[in-house]
């Protein structure tokens, strides 16, 4: 069952699917000046059995000007929103991702792929959030969202991540100021961040997510 909506957006944060559930579709999109080859697939589909999942179909792009140049590779990892576009990022593959049953790995890139990807997620898909560069997490509640089916409708759970660009100030005179994250910077003059305890820099995300996969701002 396809999810009706996109994963929720969080201010100053981006999300990433660590693996894609079987049934996920990725549109075959080509960059400007290129088009899908005639009779080429419209999308790639994550399919599989109990022991192995993989992307069916191949995306192939050809020059819009010439008809006989068809080079093809497989697609590239990406932070995506279902039916929404985001910029491409360099391939970063978490080591534990392949072991997730019923899920496909991030597909590697194909030649002349569009700079943005469009995924169509299915019920059960989970995406993970992290503050973009220049912002830090004020609050790190569950930093993921899951597409769930309730009462015959799909909905994504609301991540409880709050990203702020506020400058830290110590709340109590004489209190040792915790170390700010390197990205912290003043953002607003109308509210002020105060820190009362040491802040845990590493985001606590499920499934031993590696923060290094967040390499691009998507918003």
């Amino acid at each position: 069952e396809l999810c009706d909506d996109d994963p929720p957006e969080i201010p100053h944060a981006t999300f990433k699917a660590m693996a894609y559930k079987e049934g996920t579709m990725l549109n075959c999109e080509c960059k400007r000046g290129f088009r899908r080859i005639k009779s080429g697939s419209l999308y790639m589909l994550c399919t599989g059995n109990s022991s192995h999942s993989s992307w069916d179909n191949q995306c192939q792009c050809t020059s819009s000007a010439t008809r006989n140049t068809t080079k093809q590779v497989t697609p590239q990892p990406e932070e995506q929103k279902e039916r929404k576009t985001t910029e491409m990022q360099s391939p970063m593959q978490p080591v534990d991702q392949a072991s997730l049953p019923g899920h496909c790995r991030e597909p590697p890139p194909w030649e002349n792929e569009a700079t943005e990807r469009i995924y169509h997620f299915v019920v059960g898909q989970m995406v993970y959030y992290q503050c973009v560069q220049g912002y830090r997490a004020l609050h790190r509640g569950p930093a993921e969202s899951v597409c769930k089916m309730t009462h015959g409708k799909t909905r994504w759970t609301q991540p409880q991540l709050i990203c702020t660009g506020e400058m830290e100030t110590s709340q109590f005179p004489g209190e040792e100021k915790p170390q700010a994250s390197p990205e912290g910077r003043p953002e607003s003059e109308t509210s002020c961040l105060v820190t009362t305890t040491d802040f845990q820099i590493q985001t606590e995300m499920a499934a031993t997510m590696e923060t290094s996969i967040f390499t691009t701002e998507y918003q």
Epitope: P8, E9, I162, Q171, S188, T195, T196
Partner: antibody, heavy 115, light 107 residues
């Protein structure tokens, strides 16, 4: 079920301080940040600030900076909002509200500042 | 600060009417907008979050739409229990400001 239960009404004199509590139950307290919102009689809603129930970090609206202190006690799943140097215009109902989207609210605490 | 402006400030409508309340942000807030209903002497109640997602337990006659700076809360068929004051609020950046409210009365 999710509940936010606030402390009872307070009457304070100008210049005094008030500390309002908000106890969360029915969910994992540290999963959700806690916001504080106030409403003066016959007026609209005014956001005061937010505190991370996990880390204790807080952001205050500039208007209240220097007068407000938000804290949490994870052991009792309680958030606190203390407002000092009270003046008559601080007379209001003070609410706590949970999470990014303020999906649950406390019942409100009436604070009256009067000489 | 981001200013949130609601219109109208008050309105009176009959049971069964379609009612629309609008909220305008002073800058682009994407879809980081919530709608609340408040009845006299009670705490506000979340109706819609992220501009268009209905909160759990909220009747389907309520719906939210819009993105960027212009947002709408619609009640498709007004019910007697829908009286109260409605507020929009953004969560794009601190401070999270509210609209001034729209008081809805039942004719």
């Amino acid at each position: 079920q999710v509940q936010l239960v606030q402390s009872g009404a307070e009457v304070k004199k100008p210049g005094a301080s008030v500390k309002v509590s908000c106890k969360g139950s029915g969910y994992t307290f540290t999963d959700y940040a806690m916001h504080w919102v106030r409403q003066a009689p016959g007026q609209g809603l005014e956001w005061m600030g937010v505190i991370s129930t996990y880390s204790g970090d807080a952001i205050y609206a500039q208007k209240f900076q220097g007068r407000v202190t938000m804290t949490v006690d994870k052991s009792t799943s309680t958030a606190y909002m203390e407002l000092s140097s009270l003046r008559s215009e601080d007379t209001a109902v003070y609410y706590c509200a949970r999470g990014v989207t303020f999906d649950y609210w406390g019942q409100g605490t009436t604070v009256t500042v009067s000489s | 600060d981001i200013q949130m402006t609601q219109s109208p400030s008050s309105l009176s409508a009959s049971v069964g009417d379609r009612v629309t309340i609008t909220c305008r942000a002073s800058q682009d807030i994407s879809n980081y907008l919530e709608w609340y209903q408040q009845k006299p002497g009670k705490a506000p109640k979340l109706l819609v979050y992220n501009a268009k997602t209905l909160a759990e337990g909220v009747p389907s006659r309520f719906s939210g739409s819009g993105s960027g700076t212009d947002f709408t809360l619609t009640i498709s068929s007004l019910q007697p229990e829908d009286f109260g004051t409605y507020y929009c609020q953004h969560h794009y950046d601190t401070p999270y400001t509210f609209g001034q409210g729209t008081k809805l009365e039942i004719k």
